[in-house]
């Protein structure tokens, strides 16, 4: 029961995490204009991985996509790649973990196969979470570097009279969404890996032991006994009723589907 709960919870946590990673990747607010000396501004800038936006006091927001690929900073491309890899791995992990869930029966799938699939999805979730955390952290580091660089030359004098204020950018909401989502996916992956250990049938192979009798030599070789784990794979002696009562482990709830001044 505990293993099923751990597996189910790991799946749900990972599902939320991957949804968060997707959301963060699509969000426009990876970096937002730093309102260091003007908490309410007439023109507010913010940027995402795919486009940059400007929100005016008038309430109008204009977003422009980065239509160039080669002209973008390598770091931004790297962050994009990490986030996409994270999403792809997470999506595959989710697909694998659905079939690995103990509460879902698919034909006569062995528990050993389910254990392997659970471990595979767990590892995928861990890597997916790490990709997201790495991507967000790389972007955050890039922001911090640029922030202090622009602070150093924030006001560039023009003829001593005119000032050009350089726009500084700080952490946007997407970064926090990404960190949390990556963390959740990572935790979900760890939970899946833990659940895998409980799902795996414990093979207890007793070594052959020779007993030398005085009269004649008889060697007793007990075969590989499968220890009963309570989640036993031996379904031959367990009656399964399609419409009737189920064992404690089989009764599981299925995951439900599911704009300033």
């Amino acid at each position: 029961m505990a293993v099923t709960a751990c597996q189910g919870l790991g799946f749900v946590v990972s599902l939320i995490g991957i949804a968060g990673i997707i959301a963060a990747t699509c969000m426009d607010q990876w970096s937002t204009q730093d309102l260091y000396n003007n908490p309410v501004t007439a023109v507010f800038n913010y940027q995402g991985l795919w486009r940059s936006c400007v929100r005016e006091s008038s309430g109008f927001t204009e977003c422009r996509g980065y239509f160039t690929l080669l002209g973008l900073p390598a770091m931004l491309q790297a962050v994009r790649a990490l986030m996409i890899v994270g999403i792809v791995l997470g999506a595959i992990g989710l697909l694998v973990s659905i079939f690995a869930l103990k509460c879902i029966r698919i034909g006569s799938m062995e528990d050993s196969a389910k254990a392997n699939m659970t471990l595979t999805s767990g590892i995928m979730f861990i890597v997916s979470g790490l990709c997201a955390i790495a991507g967000v952290s790389v972007f955050a580091n890039m922001l911090v570097t640029n922030f202090w660089m622009s602070t150093a030359n924030m006001y560039t004098g023009m003829g001593g009279m005119v000032q050009t204020v350089q726009t500084r950018y700080t952490f946007g909401a997407a970064l926090f969404v990404g960190w949390v989502a990556g963390g959740l996916t990572l935790i979900g992956g760890v939970m899946m890996c833990i659940a895998c250990r409980g799902l795996a049938p414990e093979e207890t192979n007793y070594k052959a032991v020779s007993y030398h009798a005085s009269g004649h030599s008889v060697a007793y070789k007990p075969g590989g006994f499968k220890a009963s784990t309570g989640f036993g794979s031996n379904t031959k002696n367990k009656k399964i009723y399609d419409g009737g009562a189920r064992t404690e482990d089989e009764v599981q709830s299925y995951p439900s589907k599911h704009d300033y001044v």
Partner: antibody, heavy 118, light 113 residues
Framework: EVQLQQSGAEVKKPGASVKVSCKAS????????MNWVKQSHGKNLEWIGL????????SYAQKFQGRVTMTRDKSSSTAYMELLSLRSDDTAVYYC???????????WGAGTTVTVPS | DIVMTQSPDSLAVSLGERATINCKSS????????????LTWYQQKPGQPPKLLIY???TRESGVPDRFSGSGSGTDFTLTISSLQAEDVAVYYC?????????FGAGTKLELK
């Protein structure tokens, strides 16, 4: 047709307060920010502040902060500007103006003359 | 606050001639996010509210005759009337729409010579 209809002229004693109204029609009232502008001596234009009719959010010029309050009534599509503790230098024409692209004010009310005798 | 300085204070131009009004801001009005200059030009005739002519420094408002054009970037801007008409006699204002408080220039009075 977009129209901003302002309330009539007011004469107020120093220290009193005045509430100017601006009724919008011909467009979605909550979709555009409303600005208030002061024009004294028929020349100098001065931005007082703005209100977002959708959520009631406001931003005021530092000079008027504490003395001005901007509100709106969504049901009647009307924006209000109340100016407190009136002084003689508050004598001016007050305009409401709708804000559009580029933060430009594309439609203006006819103006409300507020007179505060010294 | 951004200070908007207009020049000249007044200008007399003959009908059909070109009129040029300058506006200088104490800070750049160019927004790096969309590479647009947040400067607006208004025309005001006696007894009337101001009328929007140009926004984003060079975008003409719909219904405004094409003899009106705006140019400039950063801190220096120009409003040009290519061929002055009698109905263009008015006071012209430039406005900072980039930073609060939104500030106006003192105005340039355009008259017929």
């Amino acid at each position: 047709e977009v129209q901003l209809q302002q309330s009539g002229a007011e004469v107020k004693k120093p220290g009193a307060s005045v509430k100017v109204s601006c009724k919008a029609s011909g467009y979605s009232f909550t979709g555009y920010t409303m600005n208030w502008v002061k024009q004294s001596h028929g020349k100098n234009l001065e931005w007082i502040g703005l209100i977002n009719p959708y959520n009631g959010g406001t931003s005021y010029a530092q000079k008027f902060q504490g003395r001005v309050t901007m509100t709106r009534d969504k049901s009647s599509s009307t924006a209000y500007m109340e100016l407190l503790s009136l002084r003689s230098d508050d004598t001016a024409v007050y305009y409401c103006a709708r804000m559009n692209y580029g933060n430009a004010m594309d439609y203006w009310g006819a103006g409300t003359t507020v007179t505060v005798p010294s | 606050d951004i200070v908007m300085t207009q020049s000249p204070d007044s200008l007399a131009v003959s009908l059909g001639e070109r009129a040029t009004i300058n506006c200088k801001s104490s800070q750049s009005l160019l927004n790096s996010g969309n590479q647009k200059n947040y400067l607006t030009w208004y025309q005001q005739k006696p007894g009337q509210p101001p009328k929007l002519l140009i926004y984003w420094a060079s975008t003409r408002e719909s219904g405004v005759p094409d003899r009106f054009s705006g140019s400039g970037s950063g801190t220096d801007f120009t409003l040009t009337i290519s061929s002055l008409q009698a109905e263009d006699v008015a006071v012209y204002y430039c406005q900072n729409d980039y930073s609060y408080p939104l500030t106006f220039g003192a105005g340039t009075k355009l008259e017929l010579k």
